[in-house]
Interface confidence: low
Protein backbone atom coordinates (compact mmCIF):
# COMPACT_ATOMS: atom_id res chain seq x y z
CA UNK A 1 0.00 0.00 0.00
CA UNK A 2 1.36 3.41 -1.00
CA UNK A 3 -0.18 6.76 0.00
CA UNK A 4 0.73 9.72 -2.19
CA UNK A 5 -0.16 13.11 -0.67
CA UNK A 6 -0.25 15.77 -3.35
CA UNK A 7 -0.72 19.52 -3.32
CA UNK A 8 -2.43 21.98 -5.61
CA UNK A 9 -0.56 22.66 -8.85
CA UNK A 10 1.06 26.07 -9.15
CA UNK A 11 1.89 26.85 -12.79
CA UNK A 12 2.00 23.07 -13.19
CA UNK A 13 4.34 22.40 -10.26
CA UNK A 14 3.19 20.26 -7.34
CA UNK A 15 4.59 18.40 -4.34
CA UNK A 16 4.25 14.67 -3.73
CA UNK A 17 4.92 13.02 -0.39
CA UNK A 18 4.95 9.23 -0.12
CA UNK A 19 3.69 7.42 2.97
CA UNK A 20 4.00 10.49 5.18
CA UNK A 21 7.79 10.55 5.28
CA UNK A 22 10.88 11.18 3.18
CA UNK A 23 10.99 7.92 1.24
CA UNK A 24 11.52 8.68 -2.46
CA UNK A 25 14.82 8.16 -4.26
CA UNK A 26 15.76 10.33 -7.24
CA UNK A 27 15.11 7.43 -9.64
CA UNK A 28 11.71 6.80 -8.10
CA UNK A 29 10.94 10.53 -8.21
CA UNK A 30 11.36 10.57 -11.99
CA UNK A 31 9.18 7.45 -12.32
CA UNK A 32 6.52 8.90 -10.04
CA UNK A 33 6.33 12.19 -11.91
CA UNK A 34 6.09 10.25 -15.18
CA UNK A 35 3.13 8.31 -13.77
CA UNK A 36 1.44 11.66 -13.07
CA UNK A 37 2.07 12.57 -16.73
CA UNK A 38 4.69 15.00 -15.44
CA UNK A 39 8.42 15.53 -15.19
CA UNK A 40 10.81 16.74 -12.51
CA UNK A 41 10.59 20.56 -12.58
CA UNK A 42 13.47 22.72 -13.70
CA UNK A 43 14.65 25.48 -11.38
CA UNK A 44 12.93 28.02 -13.65
CA UNK A 45 9.62 26.18 -13.40
CA UNK A 46 9.94 26.01 -9.62
CA UNK A 47 10.72 29.73 -9.43
CA UNK A 48 7.65 30.49 -11.54
CA UNK A 49 5.50 28.38 -9.16
CA UNK A 50 7.00 30.18 -6.19
CA UNK A 51 6.15 33.54 -7.76
CA UNK A 52 2.43 32.68 -7.80
CA UNK A 53 2.23 31.38 -4.25
CA UNK A 54 3.76 27.90 -4.05
CA UNK A 55 5.56 27.06 -0.82
CA UNK A 56 6.03 23.92 1.25
CA UNK A 57 8.02 22.87 4.27
CA UNK A 58 9.37 19.66 2.69
CA UNK A 59 12.56 18.88 0.81
CA UNK A 60 11.92 17.40 -2.61
CA UNK A 61 13.65 16.58 -5.87
CA UNK A 62 13.67 18.87 -8.87
CA UNK A 63 15.97 18.57 -11.87
CA UNK A 64 19.50 18.59 -10.44
CA UNK A 65 18.65 19.68 -6.89
CA UNK A 66 16.79 18.99 -3.67
CA UNK A 67 14.84 22.10 -2.68
CA UNK A 68 12.14 23.72 -0.55
CA UNK A 69 10.18 26.63 -2.07
CA UNK A 70 9.61 29.29 0.61
CA UNK A 71 7.69 32.55 0.50
CA UNK A 72 7.44 33.35 4.20
CA UNK A 73 10.44 32.96 6.53
CA UNK A 74 9.92 30.19 9.08
CA UNK A 75 12.64 28.94 11.41
CA UNK A 76 11.59 25.30 10.94
CA UNK A 77 11.34 25.47 7.15
CA UNK A 78 14.53 25.85 5.11
CA UNK A 79 16.31 27.46 8.05
CA UNK A 80 14.27 30.67 7.80
CA UNK A 81 15.31 31.24 4.17
CA UNK A 82 12.98 32.37 1.42
CA UNK A 83 13.03 31.66 -2.31
CA UNK A 84 13.88 28.26 -3.75
CA UNK A 85 16.15 26.98 -1.00
CA UNK A 86 18.66 24.40 -2.21
CA UNK A 87 19.76 21.67 0.17
CA UNK A 88 23.53 21.23 0.07
CA UNK A 89 24.07 18.10 2.19
CA UNK A 90 22.06 15.51 0.27
CA UNK A 91 21.07 12.13 1.64
CA UNK A 92 19.27 9.70 -0.63
CA UNK A 93 15.56 10.00 0.05
CA UNK A 94 13.20 12.96 0.06
CA UNK A 95 9.78 13.89 -1.31
CA UNK A 96 9.51 14.99 -4.92
CA UNK A 97 8.18 17.88 -6.94
CA UNK A 98 6.62 17.31 -10.35
CA UNK A 99 5.71 19.55 -13.28
CA UNK A 100 2.66 18.98 -15.46
CA UNK A 101 2.95 21.00 -18.64
CA UNK A 102 -0.76 20.73 -19.40
CA UNK A 103 -1.86 22.18 -16.05
CA UNK A 104 -3.30 25.71 -15.98
CA UNK A 105 -0.74 28.54 -15.80
CA UNK A 106 -2.10 29.66 -12.44
CA UNK A 107 -3.03 27.75 -9.30
CA UNK A 108 -5.05 24.56 -9.86
CA UNK A 109 -6.59 22.94 -6.80
CA UNK A 110 -9.01 20.52 -8.38
CA UNK A 111 -8.62 16.96 -7.13
CA UNK A 112 -6.26 14.57 -8.89
CA UNK A 113 -8.12 11.28 -9.25
CA UNK A 114 -5.57 8.88 -10.69
CA UNK A 115 -2.06 8.17 -11.90
CA UNK A 116 -2.75 8.39 -15.64
CA UNK A 117 0.52 6.77 -16.71
CA UNK A 118 0.78 4.04 -14.08
CA UNK A 119 1.08 0.53 -15.43
CA UNK A 120 -0.49 -2.72 -14.26
CA UNK A 121 0.65 -3.97 -10.89
CA UNK A 122 -0.50 -5.35 -7.56
CA UNK A 123 0.13 -2.34 -5.35
CA UNK A 124 -2.74 -0.36 -3.85
CA UNK A 125 -1.91 3.28 -4.54
CA UNK A 126 -3.97 5.94 -2.77
CA UNK A 127 -3.83 9.52 -4.00
CA UNK A 128 -4.65 11.92 -1.15
CA UNK A 129 -5.54 15.46 -2.22
CA UNK A 130 -5.17 18.52 -0.03
CA UNK A 131 -8.93 18.70 0.44
CA UNK A 132 -8.91 15.22 1.99
CA UNK A 133 -10.36 13.39 -0.99
CA UNK A 134 -8.80 9.99 -1.64
CA UNK A 135 -8.66 7.97 -4.85
CA UNK A 136 -7.49 4.36 -4.88
CA UNK A 137 -6.13 2.35 -7.76
CA UNK A 138 -4.07 -0.80 -8.25
CA UNK A 139 -0.93 -0.39 -10.24
CA UNK A 140 2.77 0.31 -10.36
CA UNK A 141 4.82 3.30 -11.38
CA UNK A 142 8.35 2.03 -10.86
CA UNK A 143 10.71 1.06 -13.61
CA UNK A 144 12.84 -0.43 -10.80
CA UNK A 145 10.19 -2.12 -8.65
CA UNK A 146 12.65 -3.97 -6.42
CA UNK A 147 13.07 -0.64 -4.63
CA UNK A 148 9.35 -0.29 -3.74
CA UNK A 149 9.85 -0.71 -0.03
CA UNK A 150 13.22 0.91 0.70
CA UNK A 151 15.09 -1.15 3.26
CA UNK A 152 16.37 1.98 4.95
CA UNK A 153 13.91 4.86 4.59
CA UNK A 154 15.01 8.13 6.12
CA UNK A 155 12.61 10.03 8.32
CA UNK A 156 14.42 13.36 8.46
CA UNK A 157 12.86 16.30 10.15
CA UNK A 158 12.86 19.58 8.31
Amino acid sequence: QIDLNITCRFAGVFHVEKNGRYSISRTEAADLCKAFNSTLPTMAQMEKALSIGFETCRYGFIEGHVVIPRIHPNSICAANNTGVYILTSNTSQYDTYCFNASAPPEEDCTSVTDLPNAFDGPITITIVNRDGTRYVQKGEYRTNPEDIYPSNPTDDDV
Epitope: G20, E55, I76, C109, G132
Partner: antibody, heavy 117, light 108 residues
Framework: QVQLVQSGAEVKKPGASVKVSCKAS????????MHWVRQAPGQRLEWMGW????????KYSQKFQGRVTITRDTSASTAYMELSSLRSEDTAVYYC??????????WGQGTLVTVSS | EIVLTQSPGTLSLSPGERATLSCRAS???????LAWYQQKPGQAPRLLIY???SRATGIPDRFSGSGSGTDFTLTISRLEPEDFAVYYC?????????FGGGTKVEIK
Amino acid sequence: QVQLVQSGAEVKKPGASVKVSCKASGYTFTNYAMHWVRQAPGQRLEWMGWINTGNGNTKYSQKFQGRVTITRDTSASTAYMELSSLRSEDTAVYYCARFYSGSGSPWGQGTLVTVSS
Amino acid sequence: EIVLTQSPGTLSLSPGERATLSCRASQSVSSSYLAWYQQKPGQAPRLLIYGASSRATGIPDRFSGSGSGTDFTLTISRLEPEDFAVYYCQQYGSSPLTFGGGTKVEIK
Protein backbone atom coordinates in the same frame (compact mmCIF):
# COMPACT_ATOMS: atom_id res chain seq x y z
CA GLN B 1 -10.38 40.12 -5.90
CA VAL B 2 -11.61 36.63 -5.08
CA GLN B 3 -15.19 36.66 -3.83
CA LEU B 4 -17.86 34.10 -3.01
CA VAL B 5 -21.37 35.58 -2.79
CA GLN B 6 -24.17 33.43 -1.40
CA SER B 7 -27.94 33.65 -1.80
CA GLY B 8 -30.10 35.20 0.91
CA ALA B 9 -31.64 33.83 4.10
CA GLU B 10 -34.35 31.17 3.87
CA VAL B 11 -37.16 30.06 6.17
CA LYS B 12 -38.40 26.53 5.55
CA LYS B 13 -40.86 24.11 7.07
CA PRO B 14 -39.80 20.68 8.38
CA GLY B 15 -39.66 18.12 5.56
CA ALA B 16 -39.01 20.74 2.88
CA SER B 17 -35.80 21.27 0.87
CA VAL B 18 -33.55 24.29 0.54
CA LYS B 19 -31.10 25.19 -2.24
CA VAL B 20 -28.33 27.68 -1.49
CA SER B 21 -26.20 29.21 -4.25
CA CYS B 22 -22.61 30.45 -4.16
CA LYS B 23 -21.38 32.66 -7.00
CA ALA B 24 -17.62 32.86 -7.45
CA SER B 25 -15.67 35.70 -9.02
CA GLY B 26 -12.08 36.87 -9.30
CA TYR B 27 -10.57 33.49 -10.17
CA THR B 28 -10.95 30.52 -12.52
CA PHE B 29 -13.96 28.72 -11.06
CA THR B 30 -13.08 25.28 -12.42
CA ASN B 31 -9.59 25.33 -10.88
CA TYR B 32 -10.81 24.85 -7.32
CA ALA B 33 -13.02 22.43 -5.46
CA MET B 34 -15.88 24.08 -3.59
CA HIS B 35 -16.80 22.93 -0.11
CA TRP B 36 -19.90 23.46 2.00
CA VAL B 37 -19.74 23.87 5.75
CA ARG B 38 -22.50 24.67 8.21
CA GLN B 39 -22.60 26.15 11.69
CA ALA B 40 -25.62 25.64 13.93
CA PRO B 41 -26.13 28.27 16.67
CA GLY B 42 -23.39 27.92 19.28
CA GLN B 43 -22.01 24.79 17.58
CA ARG B 44 -18.74 23.90 15.91
CA LEU B 45 -18.28 24.15 12.17
CA GLU B 46 -19.39 21.03 10.32
CA TRP B 47 -18.15 19.96 6.87
CA MET B 48 -20.93 18.73 4.57
CA GLY B 49 -19.18 17.90 1.33
CA TRP B 50 -17.40 19.22 -1.73
CA ILE B 51 -17.61 19.32 -5.50
CA ASN B 52 -14.74 19.11 -7.96
CA THR B 53 -15.85 22.05 -10.08
CA GLY B 54 -13.78 20.82 -13.00
CA ASN B 55 -15.47 17.45 -13.54
CA GLY B 56 -18.49 17.60 -11.23
CA ASN B 57 -17.40 14.78 -8.93
CA THR B 58 -18.76 15.08 -5.40
CA LYS B 59 -17.90 13.72 -1.97
CA TYR B 60 -20.29 14.01 0.96
CA SER B 61 -19.92 13.62 4.69
CA GLN B 62 -21.58 10.38 5.74
CA LYS B 63 -23.75 12.37 8.13
CA PHE B 64 -25.45 14.13 5.20
CA GLN B 65 -25.26 11.35 2.61
CA GLY B 66 -28.62 10.94 0.92
CA ARG B 67 -29.91 14.35 2.03
CA VAL B 68 -27.38 16.70 0.47
CA THR B 69 -26.69 17.32 -3.22
CA ILE B 70 -23.93 19.65 -4.39
CA THR B 71 -23.92 20.77 -8.01
CA ARG B 72 -22.31 23.47 -10.11
CA ASP B 73 -22.98 25.57 -13.19
CA THR B 74 -19.61 26.34 -14.74
CA SER B 75 -21.06 28.88 -17.18
CA ALA B 76 -22.35 30.91 -14.21
CA SER B 77 -19.34 30.16 -11.94
CA THR B 78 -21.83 29.10 -9.32
CA ALA B 79 -22.01 26.16 -6.90
CA TYR B 80 -25.21 24.96 -5.28
CA MET B 81 -25.98 23.00 -2.13
CA GLU B 82 -29.41 21.43 -1.74
CA LEU B 83 -30.46 19.87 1.57
CA SER B 84 -33.68 17.87 1.70
CA SER B 85 -35.94 16.47 4.44
CA LEU B 86 -35.20 19.48 6.62
CA ARG B 87 -35.61 19.23 10.38
CA SER B 88 -35.32 21.83 13.11
CA GLU B 89 -31.72 20.85 13.88
CA ASP B 90 -30.77 21.88 10.34
CA THR B 91 -31.25 25.51 11.38
CA ALA B 92 -27.77 26.91 10.78
CA VAL B 93 -25.62 29.27 8.77
CA TYR B 94 -24.42 27.51 5.61
CA TYR B 95 -21.12 28.54 4.06
CA CYS B 96 -19.43 27.77 0.76
CA ALA B 97 -15.64 27.83 0.95
CA ARG B 98 -12.67 27.39 -1.37
CA PHE B 99 -10.17 25.60 0.84
CA TYR B 100 -6.41 25.26 1.14
CA SER B 101 -4.70 27.35 -1.41
CA GLY B 102 -1.55 29.36 -1.09
CA SER B 103 -3.56 32.42 -2.03
CA GLY B 104 -5.87 32.04 0.95
CA SER B 105 -9.17 30.41 1.68
CA PRO B 106 -12.13 32.61 0.76
CA TRP B 107 -15.53 31.81 2.25
CA GLY B 108 -18.97 33.06 1.32
CA GLN B 109 -20.71 35.43 3.71
CA GLY B 110 -23.01 32.65 4.91
CA THR B 111 -26.69 31.92 4.38
CA LEU B 112 -28.97 31.52 7.37
CA VAL B 113 -31.47 28.69 6.92
CA THR B 114 -34.20 28.56 9.56
CA VAL B 115 -36.35 25.43 9.80
CA SER B 116 -39.55 26.11 11.71
CA SER B 117 -43.12 24.95 11.62
CA GLU C 1 -13.45 10.22 11.72
CA ILE C 2 -10.71 12.32 13.31
CA VAL C 3 -12.00 14.16 16.38
CA LEU C 4 -10.25 17.45 17.21
CA THR C 5 -10.30 18.66 20.81
CA GLN C 6 -9.36 22.26 21.48
CA SER C 7 -8.23 23.66 24.80
CA PRO C 8 -8.82 25.75 26.70
CA GLY C 9 -12.46 26.46 25.85
CA THR C 10 -11.98 30.11 26.84
CA LEU C 11 -8.80 32.13 27.26
CA SER C 12 -9.02 35.44 29.13
CA LEU C 13 -6.07 37.68 28.33
CA SER C 14 -5.13 41.34 27.99
CA PRO C 15 -3.90 43.08 24.83
CA GLY C 16 -0.14 42.64 24.48
CA GLU C 17 -0.15 39.23 26.14
CA ARG C 18 0.80 35.96 24.47
CA ALA C 19 -1.94 33.44 23.65
CA THR C 20 -1.30 29.72 23.25
CA LEU C 21 -4.11 27.60 21.87
CA SER C 22 -4.01 23.81 21.68
CA CYS C 23 -5.62 21.35 19.26
CA ARG C 24 -5.34 17.61 19.87
CA ALA C 25 -6.39 15.01 17.28
CA SER C 26 -7.81 11.57 18.11
CA GLN C 27 -5.44 10.07 15.51
CA SER C 28 -2.47 11.31 13.55
CA VAL C 29 -3.26 14.07 11.05
CA SER C 30 -1.89 13.09 7.63
CA SER C 31 1.09 15.19 6.54
CA SER C 32 0.28 17.95 9.03
CA TYR C 33 -2.80 18.89 7.03
CA LEU C 34 -4.09 21.09 9.80
CA ALA C 35 -5.48 24.61 9.49
CA TRP C 36 -6.41 27.33 11.98
CA TYR C 37 -9.26 29.80 11.46
CA GLN C 38 -10.36 32.95 13.25
CA GLN C 39 -14.06 33.77 13.47
CA LYS C 40 -15.67 36.94 14.74
CA PRO C 41 -19.40 37.25 15.55
CA GLY C 42 -21.54 37.42 12.43
CA GLN C 43 -18.59 36.77 10.11
CA ALA C 44 -17.31 33.80 8.13
CA PRO C 45 -14.15 32.06 9.35
CA ARG C 46 -10.86 33.48 8.11
CA LEU C 47 -7.91 31.22 7.34
CA LEU C 48 -4.82 31.99 9.45
CA ILE C 49 -2.57 28.93 9.14
CA TYR C 50 -2.51 25.95 6.79
CA GLY C 51 -0.20 22.95 6.69
CA ALA C 52 0.16 23.32 10.49
CA SER C 53 2.72 26.11 10.22
CA SER C 54 2.32 28.12 7.00
CA ARG C 55 0.72 31.55 7.36
CA ALA C 56 -1.99 32.35 4.83
CA THR C 57 -1.62 35.41 2.62
CA GLY C 58 -1.98 38.67 4.51
CA ILE C 59 -1.86 37.16 7.99
CA PRO C 60 0.37 39.12 10.42
CA ASP C 61 3.50 37.36 11.67
CA ARG C 62 2.30 37.50 15.28
CA PHE C 63 0.28 34.39 14.35
CA SER C 64 2.28 31.17 14.18
CA GLY C 65 1.39 27.50 14.06
CA SER C 66 3.37 24.45 15.08
CA GLY C 67 2.99 20.75 15.76
CA SER C 68 2.60 17.47 13.94
CA GLY C 69 0.95 14.10 14.40
CA THR C 70 -1.73 14.60 17.01
CA ASP C 71 -0.68 17.78 18.83
CA PHE C 72 -0.86 21.24 17.30
CA THR C 73 -0.54 24.76 18.66
CA LEU C 74 -1.55 28.22 17.50
CA THR C 75 0.42 31.04 19.12
CA ILE C 76 -0.43 34.74 19.00
CA SER C 77 2.75 36.42 20.21
CA ARG C 78 1.20 39.76 21.25
CA LEU C 79 -2.56 40.10 21.29
CA GLU C 80 -3.98 43.07 19.43
CA PRO C 81 -7.53 44.32 20.15
CA GLU C 82 -8.73 42.84 16.83
CA ASP C 83 -7.48 39.35 17.79
CA PHE C 84 -10.21 38.72 20.35
CA ALA C 85 -12.38 36.13 18.61
CA VAL C 86 -13.05 32.38 18.40
CA TYR C 87 -10.34 30.17 16.89
CA TYR C 88 -10.98 26.81 15.26
CA CYS C 89 -8.57 24.12 14.15
CA GLN C 90 -9.46 21.89 11.20
CA GLN C 91 -7.89 18.77 9.74
CA TYR C 92 -8.06 18.13 6.02
CA GLY C 93 -5.83 15.08 5.74
CA SER C 94 -8.67 12.56 5.74
CA SER C 95 -12.36 12.53 4.98
CA PRO C 96 -14.59 13.68 6.54
CA LEU C 97 -12.87 17.00 7.12
CA THR C 98 -13.42 17.93 10.77
CA PHE C 99 -13.20 21.02 12.98
CA GLY C 100 -12.39 21.47 16.64
CA GLY C 101 -14.92 22.90 19.06
CA GLY C 102 -13.16 26.27 19.18
CA THR C 103 -11.29 28.39 21.71
CA LYS C 104 -12.71 31.79 22.59
CA VAL C 105 -10.04 34.41 23.25
CA GLU C 106 -11.68 37.14 25.30
CA ILE C 107 -10.49 40.39 26.89
CA LYS C 108 -9.59 40.03 30.55
